[in-house]
């Protein structure tokens, strides 16, 4: 019988008492085969973290700073359940740490040196740890003691709870630096008052502070937020302009064998029986013998953290950077305006080989990082392990939802000013063999399908979106008799036609021979009835243009396109017979790397782009024997985006809407994780 006990870790007598009450009340409402609670008492949260790692306990609720400690080796814990605040309809699991300034003050984030600062309190998250952690490498050396470095960075501050004797500048704006509400500038509202009164130039607070202190929109309009990209935004645009997004209070468990499903089952049932306004005799979110025992008193309920989310993703790049800076205190030798090497994310070993060659030729400008799937690469860019990669539009959508930004677009047509003119896009098509003359768009049911990969534009999002509108369900594996759609569940009929061997079967990378445009076309040639690809795929792999044995004798005339009106047309008539226009592939990165990625890639394409004529004796960035490694092989240049610099603007309203509609069919664990952070 599986052990269905969750051993909860308590850190005080009062918590242990509440835990025992929790245990007894759960016993009274949950059947004997359901989850149960046991209580383990430890002296501190860090002891609880160690106990969970050592399998002596299973769960504890922590604030963000401790979630970071819990994630560090050797603990390796992960977030599994989040407390939420506000309403069930609009649950808040995160708050945003922001830098608020007066509208007319005219300086940016990178011009804070010499300004006067207002903090909620020394050592507090939004008011100190996050802003000072992010500014850490700009502080004057020596950076220890930290208070002295901060005092020398700003021209005056109010940092309640600081030592006013040793660091008088930190108390200059609030004499005495009192550590309670007796100090008018203490806490969130106090720090904001410090700004409002004109004592300080910037206040480091939570996003909600401004709304709690200024009910009137006209008053709020006198303030702005400083963004990390050295711009400003209105105070209600905090989701796009903050220092960090911080989880409020989170249950953590072991990463391996951590009972996360059991913990969720327990807490979900607990909130049903003992949540807000549920029971008089025991309340989960109430602490008669103290404050915030086991859970925050202000919590309204629990949400399950998506399984794909590790602590780094949950805490977010900015928060992790800030805390790591404060804890480790390491900075680059001397901050320069020079760009660091761009860490390119390569999929599997074929892309890695090309990336390595690029890296050797780039003379220190490009480094390589490997991952097995596109989603793993996106996750690595999010957390700073990698910086950039070029993505199909479907993944630009996911990357955008995860906070990444497009920076350059692949262009496929030769033109005089290629780099200045991003193209409208390419065509997504459905290709069939000419010999299968009865096949049309209207009778694809039961046929064998070939897709570039799940989640990609031409191979999945466009054809499956159109199909979904017709069949109104997501069971595409039942619609087609079999197929190859790399990235599908291994036991799905949409992996049946794939050719990868062993663990590589149906993998969404080049180890699966039917992956990508060329792979999907090969699948049609060898096994399938229809392939969903781009309009250039057939000409690029016929007429001897692809020398691989399977392709070298193919003739473009032996293939036709399916049109949405039920007719068929020759391959060259794609402009009048396609499924939809698809946005070109684009390079994505984190916002903080945008300028450097842009600069370095433009240099790199001038050295190794399509101006290189002899690819047998030189490195060519846009060539890989029709395998589209790192970039599509038909890329002519990487073009500036001008104002299309967000994923929504880049992909266009129509495509974003189409992918949004397909979301209900999404199997993307990363998309689920990212929409948890930003619904």
């Amino acid at each position: 019988v599986p052990d269905k006990t969750v051993r909860w870790c308590a850190v005080s007598e009062h918590e242990a008492t509440k835990c025992q009450s929790f245990r007894d009340h759960m016993k009274s409402v949950i059947p004997s085969d359901g989850p149960s609670v046991a209580c383990v008492k430890k002296a501190s949260y860090l002891d609880c973290i160690r106990a969970i790692a050592a399998n002596e306990a299973d769960a504890v609720t922590l604030d963000a700073g401790l979630v970071y400690d819990a994630y560090l080796a050797p603990n390796n814990l992960k977030p599994v359940v989040a407390e939420f605040y506000g309403s069930k309809e609009d649950p808040q699991t995160f708050y945003y740490a922001v830098a608020v300034v007066k509208k007319d003050s005219g300086f940016q984030m990178n011009q804070l040196r010499g300004k006067k600062s207002c903090h909620t309190g020394l050592g507090r998250s939004a008011g100190w740890n996050i802003p000072i952690g992010l500014l850490y490498c700009d502080l004057p050396e020596p950076r220890k003691p930290l208070e002295k470095a901060v005092a020398n960075f700003f021209s005056g501050s109010c940092a309640p709870c600081a030592d006013g004797t040793d660091f008088p500048q930190l108390c200059q704006l609030c004499p005495g630096c009192g550590c309670s509400t007796l100090n008018q500038y203490f806490g969130y509202s106090g720090a904001f008052k410090c700004l409002k009164d004109g004592a300080g130039d910037v206040a480091f607070v939570k996003h909600s502070t401004i709304f709690e202190n200024l009910a009137n929109k006209a008053d709020r309009d006198q303030y702005e937020l400083l963004c990390l990209d050295n711009t400003r935004k209105p105070v209600d645009e905090y989701k796009d302009c903050h220092l960090a997004q911080v989880p409020s209070h989170t249950v953590v468990a072991r990463s391996m064998g951590g009972k996360e499903d059991l913990i969720w089952e327990l807490l979900n049932q607990a909130q049903e029986h003992f949540g807000k306004d549920k029971s008089k005799e025991f309340q989960l979110f109430s602490s008669p013998h103290g404050k915030d025992l086991l859970f925050k008193d202000s919590a309204h309920g629990f949400l399950k953290v998506p399984p794909r989310m590790d602590a780094k993703m949950y805490l977010g790049y900015e928060y992790v950077t800030a805390i790591r800076n404060l804890r480790e205190g390491t900075c680059p030798e001397a901050p320069t305006d020079e760009c660091k090497p761009v860490k390119w994310c390569a999929l599997s070993h074929h892309e890695r080989l090309k990336c390595d060659e690029w890296s050797v030729n780039s003379v220190g400008k490009i480094e390589c990082v490997s991952a097995e799937t596109t989603e793993d690469c996106i996750a690595k860019i999010m957390n700073g392990e990698a910086d950039a990669m070029s993505l199909d539009g479907g993944f630009v959508y996911i990357a955008g939802k995860c906070g990444l930004v497009p920076v350059l677009a692949e262009n496929y047509n030769k033109s005089d000013n290629c780099e200045d003119t991003p193209e409208a896009g390419y065509f997504a098509i459905a290709v069939v063999k000419k010999s299968a003359s009865d096949l049309t768009w209207d009778n694809l049911k039961g046929k064998k399908s070939c897709h570039t990969a799940v989640g990609r534009t031409a191979g999945w999002n466009i054809p499956m979106g159109l199909l979904y509108n017709k069949i109104n369900h997501c069971r595409f594996d039942e619609f087609f008799s079999e197929g190859c759609a790399p990235g599908s569940k291994k036991d799905s009929s949409l992996c049946k036609l794939c050719m990868g061997s062993g663990l590589n079967l149906c993998e969404p990378n080049n180890k699966e021979g039917y992956y990508g445009y060329t792979g999907a076309f090969r699948c049609l040639v060898e096994k399938g009835d229809v392939a969903f690809v781009k309009h250039q795929t057939v000409p690029q792999n016929t007429g001897g243009k692809n020398p691989d044995p399977w392709a070298k004798n193919l003739n473009e005339k032996d293939y036709e396109l399916l049109c949405l009106d039920g007719t068929r047309k020759p391959v060259e008539e794609y402009a009048n017979c396609h499924l939809a226009r698809a946005p070109n592939h684009a390079v994505v990165t984190r916002k903080d790397k945008e300028a450097c990625v842009h600069k370095i890639l433009r240099q790199q394409q001038h050295l190794f782009g399509s101006n290189v004529t002899d690819c047998s004796g030189n490195f060519c960035l846009f060539r890989s024997e029709t395998k589209d490694l790192l970039f599509r092989d038909d890329t002519v240049c990487l073009a500036k985006l001008h104002d299309r610099n967000t994923y929504e603007k880049y992909l266009g309203e129509e495509y974003v809407k189409a992918v949004g509609n397909l979301r209900k069919c999404s199997t993307s664990s990363l998309l689920e994780a990212c929409t948890f952070r930003r619904p």
Epitope: E357, V363, S624
Partner: nanobody, 117 residues
Amino acid sequence: EVQLVECGGGLVQPGGSLRLSCAASGSIAGINTMAWYRQAPGQQRELVAGITRSGSTKYADSVKGRFTISRDNAKNTLYLQMNSLKPEDTAVYYCTDYSRGYYQDYWGQGTQVTVSS
């Protein structure tokens, strides 16, 4: 297509040195990029060092300051001088010129380097 044959590996004590050679069956003067990779048991193959025709080089962080890559176009040979060897340098070492493309999984026999006391 140029064939490449690696040699020079062997058993060496920690702190010792080895010089690996990679002899090409034809001219390497026109080959842009050449590189040494290594693969330890149960690990992915990783880039150790690379060199371009113009002589610019790149090294993995783990070997910087200890290993030196060079090429002699007249002798059609690529070299890897390995000093201050450590047990974690134990692996099979391969050379490549990338000319077979990134997709063909063709690698030579390689040469085994074992660093152990």
